[in-house]
Interface confidence: low
Amino acid sequence: VLPAKPENISCIFYYEENFTCTWSPEKEASYTWYKVKRTYSYGYKSDICSTDNSTRGNHASCSFLPPTITNPDNYTIQVEAQNADGIMKSDITYWNLDAIMKIEPPEIFSVKSVLGIKRMLQIKWIRPVLAPHSSTLKYTLRFRTINSAYWMEVNFTKEDIDRDETYNLTELQAFTEYVMTLRCAPAESMFWSGWSQEKVGTTEEEAPYGLDLWRVLKPAMVDGRRPVQLMWKKATGAPVLEKALGYNIWYFPENNTNLTETVNTTNQTHELYLGGKTYWVYVVSYNSLGESPVATLRIPALNEKTFQCIEAMQACLTQDQLVVEWQSSAPEVDTWMVEWFPDVDSEPSSFSWESVSQARNWTIQKDELKPLWCYNISVYPVLRDRVGQPYSTQAYVQEGIPSAGPVTQADSIGVKTVTITWKEIPKSKRNGFIKNYTIFYQAEDGKEFSKTVNSNILQYRLESLTRRTSYSLQVMASTNAGGTNGTKINFKTLSISHHHHHHHHHH
């Protein structure tokens, strides 16, 4: 059987390296060898490239090497397939070297911002050494922000033969890291070089983008002054790299700018002491290039009635998040401020806050909160410059069993009764919401009994005990994760009724 006619001939000119053609079929049933017939020098010369018939198997590719590679030139290529049964020739194909030339990638040596030109990066590269000198090269520049998965592309051409070339990429984000890579090809060629090594550059810093501003209103002091804790942070959407040198605060009573006071600080929090009237507070951040837009906050008068619109709130846990959702009776409110901090007996060490827009839910990754800690979460409605009444809830991202059980004592011991009282477990030792308490009690050598009561009960009267009997007793506090017993106490019921109370404290 004759070999199949070679088809799908494809040739590529690797500049100053070789001229390679491939074809199909790649495999033949019987051993086949190939000749590639070429005419070059615009048809004046011809030669042959043979596949290596010393290697068994088919080889549907052949390369012509310098010095017979002439450029510019037009080649014709015909492939002959031969086996024991005969020869089969392909159609003659025509190749213009300029159209199939492939060159090395360029080398980017710098990606830098240009002083005073915002949101631009200048890319400098070296043309490939192995590229035709007089050739116009076309380029594709690919770029993306450092944390993005998507490349954007820009195409351009360079006519000159200067080996040090530049391109100015504009309309970028300020103070942002970009990754660049470049490829090139002779203007007429269908084959692009590979991509250059990636290079990173950062756009110039600008004046800060803006601030998010919030406050905590504290109770008025005896002298009538109100402590107001101001806090601010970089606005959502600000460039990741943005840094501020400092912050200017100014504040004044409403309708009386004559009483304006100013403060400069490098902290992101500041305590003001205000009178009972309505105040306005303004904060800007600044760096060496200028100031951010002003962040404004209205502090209501002491006696001002605030609006209430949050009707209900739920906190629920997903696999790796805490989600808080709320319902509102005011459809016009679409901005909310969420505060969260640990519920501890002392002043909370960490206080966090975040603005939510156009949603009635807030989500936080569980790993941003500590397990076994109770968090207070409050949501404030914000309508233009007015802040409404908050709605608060508590949540644990992970509950555990309490670190200690309740401290218990037996009071009012009678003949057949006893009143048990116990103290709430300190917040730091609860490790979860206390669901209930269980009282375990047992007479000496007798059966153990238990009684479970709600978490809001801290006292219980046991009845139907046996007179003049020693009992041991302990109270267990339970969370969703399980329970922990308090210390065991012992008491003995009386043999006859007394009119006065006995207080036994056995620990």
Epitope: R142, A149, W151, M152, E153, N155, E171, Q173
Partner: antibody
């Protein structure tokens, strides 16, 4: 107003070829990646092909790689999908979509055409 | 490729209901999840981008939440015109992938 108008769909036999067209208007075509998404009758959405704003790079899922070719003519604000070696499982409505733009990838598929139905059947 | 698993596949609801559907990504996609609505015989329409941002002109009864691998889409007060199939899509990494859809039907 942004508009994307697809055409070129129809009934075709398995193994044959078909070319879809999408003419864009109302925006600067060469600032945007463009994408073809398809939806088999009664089924969900499947990404088919994307092309970068300059046409320099193209992307395909394995299900169509080697058979479908996405291309564009920025001068004509037109997107193409050349479909070769068609199979019955390619039967679907093919939507032309825009996104993302030069500055980033905030919204992927904001604008969709009305779709063009391709039926592959003998 | 990242697989987006949507649940439930269909729901029977009444006007005024609160409707919640979920989408789970096979790996972390940050907040790069969009939600689309497709009514019968129409092209899909973007409702929510970047997990929780409502697209221009979308009513505020539509909300989205989540990040990482778990995402939720809620219609707080179901209207008759909301009957449609809803799809989630991740755009965090190539290729973009869609969930199988949740179809809303009237009881």
């Amino acid at each position: 107003e942004v508009q994307l108008v697809e055409s070129g769909g129809g009934l075709v036999q398995p193994g044959r070829t078909l070319k879809l067209f999408c003419v864009a208007s109302g925006f600067t075509f060469n600032n945007y990646w463009m994408t073809w998404i398809r939806q088999a009758p009664g089924k969900g959405l499947e990404w088919v092909a994307s092309i970068t704003n300059t046409g320099g790079s193209t992307y395909y899922p394995d299900s169509v790689k080697g058979r479908f070719t996405i291309s564009r003519d920025n001068a004509k604000s037109t997107l193409y999908l050349q479909m070769n070696s068609l199979r019955s499982e390619d039967t679907a409505t093919y939507y032309c979509t825009r996104g993302p733009d030069y500055g980033g990838h905030l919204n992927w598929f904001v604008y969709w055409g009305q779709g063009t139905l391709v039926t592959v059947s003998s | 490729d990242i697989v987006m698993t949507q649940s439930p596949t269909s729901m029977s609801i009444s006007v005024g209901d609160r409707v919640t559907m979920n989408c789970k990504a096979s790996q972390n996609v940050g907040s790069n999840v969009d939600w689309y609505q497709q009514k019968t015989g129409q092209s899909p329409k973007l409702l929510i981008y970047k997990a929780s941002n409502r697209y221009t002109g979308v009513p505020d009864r539509f909300t989205g939440s989540g990040s990482g691998t778990d995402f939720t889409f809620t219609i707080s007060n179901m209207q008759a015109e909301d009957l449609a199939v809803y799809y989630c899509m991740q755009s965090n990494s190539y290729p973009p992938t869609f969930g199988g859809g949740t179809k809303l039907e009237l009881k």
